[in-house]
């Protein structure tokens, strides 16, 4: 029963957890303006993986995709493949864990193979979770050393008389999502790793012995005894809560000239 | 047709307040809206803004202290507020709404405020 | 603040002739994340409110004739008209509308010579 619990809420978390990765991985808002003290700018851009944003006090808000592919920071690139290397391998994993769930009946497959899906399945969302998390940290860290490099140039003139305030860029809600995601898709991993000793067969170390009657041969062989947890669903009532943030941004539609959102 | 109808005329006494009034019509009130001064044969300057929206303003340093912006949405109308007057403040105040680049698409007729003792 | 520089202060241009004029701003006013100029021209005829004619540098609003245009990008900006006509004799506004405080410019008095 317990085995079943796990590795069902281990599916669950890790499902939410890949959830999570998918939309950090889409979300616009990787790396947005920095606006402690004041807005400076009467614009605020903000940024993700695939395009960049600006958002107007108009209301106005215009997208770009990143259109080019060798011009982009490798930094950005490595960030992009760790994360969709994270959602690649946790889609394998659920996809696995689907055929591995013990309450799941498929033909007649031996627990020992639930067992060793389960622990695949584990062993990927571990893996996915680490990427996700590697990703996003990757990205947060570049979004650090940018944030003091431009600090530290942000009053400097360019040598003449114009000035450039540079824009900072600060964590964006993907970073939080992200992080928060990887850690329940390596929690939900976990979870399946320890689910599959439980529903891995037990061993015995006990040898046949054979006992000779005179009459006739009868062989006795004292087997394991295995409990088996049965394949009804827990019905306690337990209520599996998302610990991820929930961002309402601003929906802005174009202003036109009679109805400036 | 979008409108930005202003308060009449104010004359007012050295040290005292003036709030002006900016009525919209014809669309719907939910971006900022600007204020604008314009002394006599002078340029324009920028007061503040506020948001129809969620009440939230930014001013100018330079008039901060002595200004108010306020809303009331039930009637789509702005006030702006201006206190301790002194005679520099005699002008005409525009109110505006706002457009793509953040430009001001729409004005209010413009209120003439004259600080006079 | 952003100091926004209006040249020259009045222009005087004969009707057809074509009339230019420039601002200047302390700081750039291009946003490299959509790279557009918040700059913008007003047309402000005595007694009357300021009238949008161009914004992001050079995007014309709606209703305004094809002779006004507007250029540059950065710090240096221009309005022109390519042919003046009589109806576009008026004072003229650029403002930053990229940093906070919003600025204007001096104002340039267009007149027929």
């Known amino acids: 029963m317990a085995v079943t619990a796990c590795q069902g809420l281990g599916f669950v978390v890790s499902l939410i957890g890949i959830a999570g990765i998918i939309a950090a991985t889409c979300m616009d808002q990787w790396s947005t303006q920095d606006l402690y003290n004041n807005p400076v700018t009467a614009v605020f851009n903000y940024q993700g993986l695939w395009r960049s944003c600006v958002r107007e006090s108009s209301g106005f808000t215009e997208c770009r995709g990143y259109f080019t592919l060798l011009g982009l920071p490798a930094m950005l690139q490595a960030v992009r493949a760790l994360m969709i290397v994270g959602i690649v391998l946790g889609a394998i994993g659920l996809l696995v864990s689907i055929f591995a769930l013990k309450c799941i009946r498929i033909g007649s497959m031996e627990d020992s193979a639930k067992a060793n899906m389960t622990l695949t399945s584990g062993i990927m969302f571990i893996v996915s979770g680490l990427c996700a998390i590697a990703g996003v940290s990757v990205f947060a860290n570049m979004l650090v050393t940018n944030f003091w490099m431009s600090t530290a140039n942000m009053y400097t003139g360019m040598g003449g008389m114009v000035q450039t305030v540079q824009t900072r860029y600060t964590f964006g809600a993907a970073l939080f999502v992200g992080w928060v995601a990887g850690g329940l898709t390596l929690i939900g991993g976990v979870m399946m790793c320890i689910a599959c000793r439980g529903l891995a067969p037990e061993e015995t170390n006990y040898k046949a012995v054979s006992y000779h009657a005179s009459g006739h041969s009868v062989a006795y062989k004292p087997g394991g005894f295995k409990a088996s947890t049965g394949f009804g669903s827990n019905t306690k009532n337990k209520k599996i809560y998302d610990g991820g943030a929930r961002t309402e941004d601003e929906v802005q539609s174009y202003p036109s000239k009679h109805d400036y959102v | 047709q979008v409108q930005l109808v202003q308060s009449g005329a104010e004359v007012v006494k050295p040290g005292a307040s003036v709030k002006l009034s900016c009525k919209a019509s014809?669309?719907?009130?939910?971006?900022?809206v600007h204020w604008v001064i314009q002394a006599p044969g002078q340029g324009l300057e920028w007061i503040g803004e506020?948001?129809?929206?969620?009440?939230?303003?930014n001013y100018n340093e330079k008039f901060k202290k002595r200004v108010t912006l306020t809303l009331d949405r039930s009637t789509s109308t702005v006030y702006m507020e201006l206190s301790s007057l002194r005679s520099e403040d005699t002008a005409v105040y525009f109110c505006?709404?706002?457009?793509?680049?953040?430009?001001?698409?729409?004005w209010g007729q413009g209120t003439l405020v004259t600080v006079s003792s | 603040d952003i100091v926004m520089t209006q040249s020259p202060d009045s222009l005087a241009v004969s009707l057809g002739e074509r009339a230019t004029i420039n601002c200047k701003s302390s700081?750039?006013?291009?946003?490299?994340?959509?790279?557009?100029?918040?700059l913008t021209w007003y047309q402000q005829k005595p007694g009357q409110p300021p009238k949008l004619l161009i914004y992001?540098?050079?995007t014309r609003e709606s209703g305004v004739p094809d002779r006004f245009s507007g250029s540059g990008s950065g710090t240096d900006f221009t309005l022109t008209i390519s042919s003046l006509q009589a109806e576009d004799v008026a004072v003229y506004h650029c403002?930053?509308?990229?940093?906070?405080?919003?600025?204007f410019g001096g104002g340039t008095k267009l007149e027929i010579k």
């Open positions: 505006a709404g706002i457009y793509y680049g953040n430009s001001f698409a729409h």
């Open positions: 014809g669309y719907t009130f939910t971006n900022w």
């Open positions: 506020i948001n129809p929206t969620n009440a939230r303003s």
């Open positions: 700081q750039s006013l291009l946003n490299a994340g959509n790279q557009k100029n918040y």
């Open positions: 992001w540098s050079s």
């Open positions: 403002q930053n509308n990229y940093y906070y405080p919003l600025t």
